[in-house]
Interface confidence: low
């Protein structure tokens, strides 16, 4: 006869491990007992359990409550055992020794491999600002046994670097994703993907990128110079910019206070019926936590009774 077992048994941490040991004998042969021991290299054999044809299952005190026979129906030639709730410390070499009648003893070894699936964590880097050089966007760490694979899934252009720390029974892998921040990255997902043989599917953690920026400011409303004449109603100037965080707007007049009747409504400056009093240099100040920008325009209100051309000067400054 011969013993049938597996070279390697792989289980996930916390699962039950079936350690197979089946004697395929000739007709009339019987298994008297099956002795299981742990036989790691450099250490003496540690008795695990004994399956006896007459006296039943005996379990070593060190494994009390953790070693069982598979549920019935059981083949009398099957010496397999179940190791409940596998932990990392269970990883190692095991030997099954079968005593048969009348053929004698047979033995076989197997290796138990306990997979410790990773628990990934994603840590965003420092605040991203447009104009920075290569900057850490996020780091992703996963610890498991064997070492997990940590990669990134994103449309964003960047570079990755990985390092690993080996512990006695596991390894931690940290991958960092670096990029040069630009406003186009705002709202883009950056996903850490962790692969491991103990996972049925990859674990994914997504971080949404936020890049602080402030666009140049400009003022709209003076495109048609002839509309800015005395008596015109509904004249307005609108300040254009964009940013992250969203910017706030402030209007001032460079050559004096804002004329009475002029309404400030966020990015818009609304005028009452125009008079020559409304001529002047108006400044839009745009700011957010990242930066600030100014744009100024010169308004020259035309008197239709005069035959002078209107001058408009647009200046943008940072």
């Amino acid at each position: 006869g011969e013993l049938e077992t597996s070279d390697v048994v792989t289980v996930v941490l916390g699962q039950d491990a079936k350690l197979p040991c089946f004697y395929r004998g000739d007709s009339g042969e019987q298994v008297g007992q099956v002795a299981w021991a742990r036989v790691d290299a450099g250490e003496g054999a540690q008795e695990l359990a004994l399956l006896h044809s007459k006296y039943g299952l005996h379990v070593s005190p060190a494994y009390e409550g953790r070693v069982e026979q598979p549920p019935p129906p059981r083949n009398p030639l099957d010496g397999s055992v179940l190791l409940r709730n596998a932990v990392q410390a269970d990883e190692g070499e095991y030997e099954c020794r079968v005593s048969t009648f009348p053929a004698g003893s047979f033995q076989a070894r197997l290796r138990l491999r306990v997979l410790v699936p990773p628990l990934p964590s994603l840590n965003p880097g420092p605040a991203l600002e447009e104009g920075q050089g290569l900057t850490l966007a996020a780091s992703c760490t996963a610890e498991g046994s064997p070492a997990p694979s940590v990669t990134w899934d994103t449309e964003v252009k960047g570079t990755t670097s990985s390092r690993s720390f080996k512990h006695s029974r596991s390894a931690a892998v940290t991958s960092e994703f670096h990029l040069v921040p630009s406003r186009s990255m705002n709202g883009q997902p950056l996903t850490c993907v962790v692969s491991h043989p103990g996972l049925l599917q990859d674990q994914r953690i997504t971080h949404i990128l936020h890049v602080s920026f402030l666009a140049e400011a400009s003022v709209r409303g003076l495109e048609d110079q002839n509309l800015w004449h005395i008596g015109r109603e509904g004249a307005m100037l609108k300040c254009l910019s964009e940013g992250q965080p969203p910017p706030s707007y402030n209007w001032t007049r460079l050559d004096g206070p804002l004329p009475s009747g002029v309404r400030v409504d966020g990015d818009t400056l609304g005028f009452p019926p125009l008079t020559t009093e409304h001529s002047g240099i108006y400044v839009c100040h745009v700011s957010n936590e990242f930066s600030s920008r100014d744009s100024q325009v010169t308004v020259d209100v035309l008197d239709p009774q005069e035959d002078s051309g209107k001058q408009v000067d647009l200046v943008s400054a940072s």
Partner: nanobody, 120 residues
Amino acid sequence: EVQLLESGGGLVQPGGSLRLSCAASGFTFSSYAMGWYRQAPGKEREFVSSISGSGGLTRYADSVKGRFTISRDNSKNTLYLQMNSLKPEDTAVYYCAVTTGYQGGVYDYWGQGTQVTVSS
């Protein structure tokens, strides 16, 4: 059943220290990363610190770096948070947490929390 029980909170003056503990049961403690979170009144729960199963890797929120230290004793199934140089803005309910579940699902378990108040 996973159980997490925090203790060690209390009232402390600014600049003082506290040590929080989290006793864990119902899972193989040494195999799981653990974390501390906190929630101030009217604010969302925020990450404070985390530690890997072996204790070899730690992470901290910027706001507590250099002041708080996370540690664990796997022989006692206990997670700790040593908090020094406490500030009024550290006032919150502190929770310990574990993320478990391997076969495609991830489940967060939280303790009931312990109140930390920093006030003169």
